[in-house]
């Protein structure tokens, strides 16, 4: 109804009686509320309950509560549900941010790239590379760089240095008698981790486009996580999208990982006499859910001068 | 009690503009909105618009804006509507009402040549 | 803008009569729409506003109903001061508009 858009004393709004056009001052309703009646010359206002599927936040001189907004189109779910009191509001799931009307899943750093900053539901991940000493030997959108296994300090030699997507190798050499050596020798090496195996390629994996010097890059690569995938595992990489922040950065899809969790156990390497190298590799699978951030307050707002 | 008196007809040209008065009596002048309404034969009624005479707060019909100027004057308890740039179409009675409920008696307002 | 339908426009009644003239609203106005009578060459008497409530000195054989958009005003044995026209208008949202008119005759 048509009010006069005068200021009023607080928890009061003015109203116009248009039967005698009378300019009338009334309390408001409680959040939660409507005026069913304004106020007259001879009696109060009276307040109603918003029915379902209406609101109202605050105290207010309002005809009617607002309706709630739409129910949250998938992959979106509810912060909170539509009540009396508060609109629905839509969060994306975890692993996904708001983009553009709608959830897009994190970023996921490549090998060799860790997070820089999580993801929270309205924002990215934000990757860097890893730096020396550090590396990370899974794509993964929750996990940081991790530091290099520091084999001196286990009373271990690095039998095989680590790069920015591998860890260092650790090793305790037999000695044997020169004039007795044995076919093969043997170098033992422990992680205090679990123990995967990988599928790497043979050439050391750089991102394309990405200074390998800038541990500030913002990594374009978005794995889609394909539905029904559960939260804590780390999603194939199925497709990239273009860069973030302005720069035009692109990235090629990381290397396939495959994962296959092996017991915790020490391993036992035999190596050939013609090659020294180990083929183990260190990760950790033990992937945090992302953390929840402020979401952006739901785009379904109301202003109404008798509601403020 | 509540009155509502309006001033008499008036015939203007073309292209002319009329100032209709409506005095109001029985109640405190600033305290209601003061709506103006045309009424022509066989064209129904319609909403110009409104004056709060507490503040000079006004609202028009959009189909009256830059034709109607509606004024009051609180020393005289008094609501205006100046019409300007007659035309035949603006031959008509104008009504002042307080609310939907109290109605002053009309003004006839023809434009002829 | 509101368009207030009303009917019908003319109706030929008898002394004692009960008539209903309706309006519909062209969208929800809950209960905000009055009724007015005018009498040939006069102004406006308001007989009925929010919907329902009869205003002072209006006699009781006028009843007025409906919420929302459909809404009807009721005159109950008709007494010869009652032939005259009736118009609804609805105050819910700018612009005022106003129904056709009811032109109510003695047959």
């Known amino acids: 109804q048509p009010e006069q858009k005068t200021l009023s004393l607080p928890g009061t709004y003015r109203h116009v009686d248009r039967t005698t056009g009378q300019v009338l001052t009334c309390d408001k309703c409680p959040a939660g509320t409507y005026v069913s009646e304004h106020c007259t010359n001879m009696s109060l206002r009276v307040c109603s309950s918003c029915p379902a599927g209406t609101f109202t936040r605050h105290e207010n001189g309002i005809e009617r509560c607002h309706d709630c907004s739409q129910p949250c189109p998938w992959p979106m779910i509810e912060r909170l549900p539509c009540a009396a009191l508060t609109d629905r509001e839509c969060i994306c799931p975890p692993g996904m941010y708001q983009s553009n009307g709608t959830c897009a899943p994190h970023t996921v750093c490549p090998v060799g790239w860790g997070v820089r900053k999580k993801g929270t539901e309205n924002e990215d991940v934000r990757c860097k590379q890893c730096a020396r000493g550090t590396f990370s030997d899974v794509p993964s959108s929750v996990m940081k760089c991790k530091a290099h296994t520091d084999c001196l300090g286990q009373n271990l030699e690095v039998v095989k240095p680590g790069t920015k997507e591998t860890d260092n190798v650790c090793g305790m050499r037999l000695f044997f008698s020169s004039t007795n050596p044995p076919s093969s020798g043997t170098v033992t090496f422990s992680h205090p981790e679990h123990m995967e195996s990988h599928d790497v390629p043979s050439s050391t994996y750089e991102p394309q486009g990405m200074n390998s010097t800038d541990s500030n890059s913002t990594a374009s690569v978005r794995t889609k996580v394909p539905s029904g995938i559960e939260e804590g595992t780390v999603p194939d990489n199925t497709s990239s999208t273009s860069g973030k922040e302005g720069t035009n950065r692109t990235l090629p899809n990381p290397p396939q990982v495959t994962h296959q969790q092996a017991p915790h156990h020490r391993h036992i390497l035999k190596l050939l006499p013609s090659s020294m190298e180990a083929t183990g590799e260190k990760s950790s699978t033990a992937i945090k859910a992302p953390k929840r951030g402020h979401p952006r307050q739901n785009a379904h707002k109301h202003f109404d001068i008798n509601e403020h | 009690q509540v009155q509502l008196q309006q001033s008499g007809p008036e015939v203007a040209r073309p292209g002319a503009s009329v100032k209709l008065s409506c005095k109001a009596s029985?109640?405190?002048?600033?305290?209601?909105?003061l709506n103006w309404v045309k009424q022509r034969t066989g064209q129904g009624l319609e909403w110009i618009g409104e004056?709060?005479?507490?503040?000079?707060?006004?609202y028009y019909n959009e189909k009256f804006k830059g034709k109607a100027t509606l004024t009051a004057d609180n020393s005289s308890s008094t609501a205006y509507l100046q019409f300007s740039s007659l035309t035949s179409e603006d031959s008509a009675v104008y009504f002042c009402?307080?609310?939907?409920?109290?109605w002053g008696q009309g003004t006839l307002v023809t434009v002829s040549v | 803008d509101i368009l207030m339908t009303q009917s019908p426009s003319s109706m030929s009644v008898s002394l004692g009569d009960t008539v209903s003239i309706t309006c519909h609203a062209s969208?929800?106005?809950?209960?905000?729409i009055g009724w007015l009578q005018q009498k040939p060459g006069k102004s406006f008497k308001g007989l009925i506003y929010?919907?329902?409530t009869l205003e002072d000195g209006v006699p009781s054989r006028f009843t007025g109903s409906g919420s929302g958009a459909d809404f009807s005003l009721t005159i109950s044995s008709l007494e010869s001061e009652d032939f005259a026209d009736y118009y609804c208008v609805q105050y819910a949202q700018f612009p005022y508009t106003f129904g056709g008119g009811t032109k109510l005759e003695i047959k």
């Open positions: 029985g109640y405190t002048f600033t305290d209601y909105y």
């Open positions: 969208q929800g106005i809950r209960n905000s």
């Open positions: 009402t307080r609310g939907v409920i109290k």
């Open positions: 929010h919907a329902t």
């Open positions: 004056i709060y005479p507490g503040n000079n707060h006004t």
